[in-house]
């Protein structure tokens, strides 16, 4: 469809609530300093020409692109250099070539102060102006997430009011609150840490790696429907993604209640599990849709090996219409194993193509061909292996051991990575332990891999901003669904030179007494690391001595009347302990 | 619900020349691959030619290459059989038949296609 008026179109189908949303988010995922008032003043000043062209389409500039508008309105800012340098640079640029110089300078490790709640004053900024409380949310999580996926943010803000509807009635707001805004906290950040992934394989690896991702795990969610309702909505959903992923918020969510609006139309084709989505209102909805039970198995599938193996046609099919026939051969694959990971899906699927590559050349392509579905046991083993081998350290050791044992790994592995990107990977990392170790067998696999491919997402797009090593480069460029078993062949690198022992490292303070347990951990996982730089050869008797040491300092120091006093006295002792310790 | 109805069997002599079709329907059917299979009297039901849908690509068993020729028209939701140079081994019922959804032939088992149109008879004799 064309309309005259490609933002009063959007403004028409999105309705003022979540035009102002929306348009919010995509300024606070450019401008990540501004403060939350300077935006709300853009955000008036394009509702109110939005509603100029709805009210006439043939209005002056209601013509233009909806890029060409939102980069006007960045670009006149007057204090944009000053506050965003080069960023201002892109100002002198035409569309599109503005537009992705704009998405060049997203940051994703914005240096913005972590958020902590107060229960007491958020409760009377809430009852005081829920609008602007609910836009503050938008603003704070999409500056801190310049990736995060617009439509799905809105869906979290109606939950984050709904917490606090219920929960500034209660007596005890804080017992109320507090639990709550942490479990969404969670979801909040592996949403983000989602959408980041997407973002990064349609950027990186192109529309059809994504494709590829989406065919795989919607096979698995809906193995009842077939290989072309699968294919359509993986085209409309890459169109959604790959719109969120450039900045085109507006466009995005439209598209993503179409997609809705499709599989609840065509549910009974699709899946038995989307009932209870389908009645819910447009955000819960898609919210719903995208997290969706996984629906059974049709029982009448039959062995993959007619279609893909015993066929005469399999070269045919492979020559002639290959991403066709490689397709359809991930959707059968998928859908069969609910239970493997997307990579690891991906990963076969590369093996079955190599395969065919070579044996389609060949003299006998079928008896060359005939054994291809040998050659997976081998890639389903690995990561099974792996992950049995690591809940078992993670049930021996608990989390807080776990993450400290994933510390001494990817240190030695990458030492050249920033001290602070190695403790927030390897505490992720850690994580999967407690998210994924007490699931059931079946699910622990695609729990734990599809979790870790997350994670080292966050290494890869960290390193690529500040690039040090090239093994992490490496990994992270040559196949995004080899990425995790690449960073696990990982060995210590020998070559490192070791860090020159810097006392201001392993100086501590009084505050660290007072700190919360998580950010307790992270100072000591900090000085692990530091540690393991300066000697990368550290035994694990020298580096559990140490730690010990450490804690017993801090602990002593705690105690005492005067905190600093003792932090002054003991940390140098402290330090002379730890260098004879590694001496 | 995938439908197929095939027509234009008939009697016709050795070396002439006839035209199935079938009209199919059903979400999606332009996207879905259909074959001819055939059935002689106590014979299994083999597969005769077979073409992609959505995807420009044809199939042949040995027995019918070069003498018979597949097409579809997607305007038309029809699929075509046109069978040149008959021989009476080409006697037979034949069959339209589909697997929703599947883009190509991936399969020439009679058994994995669930849907199947009622048949139409070809004679060839003089």
């Known amino acids: 469809d064309t309309y005259k008026s490609e933002i009063a179109h959007r403004f028409k189908d999105l309705g003022e609530q979540y035009f102002k949303g929306l348009v919010l988010i995509a300024f606070s995922q450019h401008l990540q300093q501004c403060p939350y008032e300077e935006h709300v003043k853009l955000v008036r000043e394009v509702t109110e020409f939005a509603k100029t062209c709805v009210a006439d389409e043939s209005a002056e500039n209601c013509d233009k692109s909806i890029h060409t508008l939102f980069g006007d309105k960045l670009c006149a800012i007057p204090s944009l250099r000053e506050h965003y340098g080069d960023l201002a640079d892109c100002c002198e640029k035409e569309e599109p070539e503005r537009n992705e110089c704009f998405l060049q300078h997203k940051n994703d490790n914005p240096d913005i102060p972590k958020l902590k709640p107060d229960p007491v004053a958020l409760c009377a900024d809430f009852q005081e102006d829920e609008q602007k409380f609910w836009g503050k949310y938008l603003y704070e999580i999409a500056r801190r997430h310049p990736y995060f996926y617009a439509p799905e943010l809105l869906y979290y803000a109606i939950i984050y009011k709904d917490v606090f509807s219920e929960c500034c009635q209660a007596a005890d707001k804080a017992a109320c609150l507090l639990p709550k805004i942490e479990h969404l906290r969670e979801k909040v950040l592996t949403s983000a840490a989602k959408q980041r992934l997407k973002c990064a394989s349609i950027q990186k690896f192109g529309e059809r790696a994504f494709k590829a991702w989406s065919l795989a795990r919607l096979s698995q969610r809906f193995p009842k429907a077939d290989f072309t309702e699968i294919s359509k909505i993986v085209t409309d959903l890459a169109k959604v993604h790959k719109e969120c992923c450039h900045g085109d918020l507006l466009e995005c969510a439209d598209d993503r209640a179409d997609l809705a609006k499709y599989i609840c139309e065509n549910q009974d084709t699709i899946s038995t599990k989307l009932k209870e989505c389908c009645d819910k209102p447009l955000l819960e909805k898609s919210h719903c849709i995208a997290e969706a039970k996984r629906d059974e198995l049709p029982a009448d599938l039959n062995p993959l090996e007619h279609d893909f193996v015993e066929d005469k046609e399999v070269c045919k099919n492979y020559k002639e219409a290959k991403h066709v026939f490689l397709g359809t051969f991930l959707y059968e694959y998928s859908r069969r194993h609910p239970d493997y990971s997307v990579s690891l899906l991906l990963r076969i699927a590369k093996i079955y193509e190599a395969t065919l590559e070579d044996c389609c050349a060949k003299e006998d392509p079928p008896a060359c061909y005939a054994t291809v579905f040998d050659k997976f046991q081998p890639l389903v083993d690995e990561p099974k292996n792996l992950i049995k081998q690591n809940c078992e350290l993670f049930e021996k050791l608990g989390e807080y051991g776990f993450q400290n044992a994933l510390i001494v790994r990817y240190t030695k592995k990458v030492p050249q990575v920033s001290t602070p990107t190695l403790v927030e990977v390897a505490r992720k990392l850690g994580l999967v332990g407690s998210r994924c170790c007490k699931r059931p067998e079946e699910e622990r696999l695609s729990c734990a891999e599809d979790y870790l491919s997350l994670v080292l997402n966050r290494l890869c797009v960290l390193h690529e901003k500040t690039p040090v090593s090239e093994k992490v480069t490496k990994c992270c460029t040559e196949s995004l669904v080899n990425r995790r078993p690449c960073f696990s062949a990982l060995t210590p690198d020998e070559t490192y030179k070791p860090k020159e022992f810097v006392e201001g490292t392993f100086t501590f303070h009084a505050d660290l007494c007072t700190l919360p347990e998580d950010e307790k951990q992270i100072k000591k996982q900090t000085a692990l690391v530091e540690l393991l730089k300066h000697k990368p050869h550290a035994t694990e008797e020298q580096l559990r001595t140490v730690l010990g040491n450490f804690a017993a300092f801090v602990q002593k120091c705690c105690a005492a009347p005067d905190h600093e006093a003792c932090f002054a006295v003991e940390g140098p002792k402290f330090v002379i302990e730890i260098r004879g310790i590694l001496a | 619900e995938v439908q197929l109805l095939e027509s234009g069997g008939g009697l016709v002599q050795p070396g002439g020349s006839l035209r199935l079709s079938c009209a199919a329907s059903?979400?999606?059917?332009?996207?879905?691959?259909v074959a001819w299979f055939r059935q002689a009297p106590g014979k299994e039901r083999e597969f005769v030619a077979g073409?992609?849908?959505?995807?420009?690509?044809?199939y042949y068993a040995d027995s019918v290459k070069g003498r018979f020729t597949i097409s579809r028209d997607n305007s038309k939701n029809t699929l075509y059989l046109q069978m040149n140079s008959l021989r009476p081994e080409d006697t037979a019922v034949y069959y339209c038949?589909?697997?929703?959804?599947?883009?190509?032939?991936?399969?020439?088992?009679?058994?994995?296609?669930?849907?199947w149109g009622q048949g139409t008879l070809v004679t060839v004799s003089s």
């Open positions: 059903g979400r999606y059917i332009d996207e879905t691959a």
């Open positions: 038949a589909a697997r929703p959804g599947q883009p190509l032939i991936t399969s020439k088992v009679a058994d994995l296609y669930p849907y």
């Open positions: 073409i992609g849908g959505g995807v420009d690509i044809t």
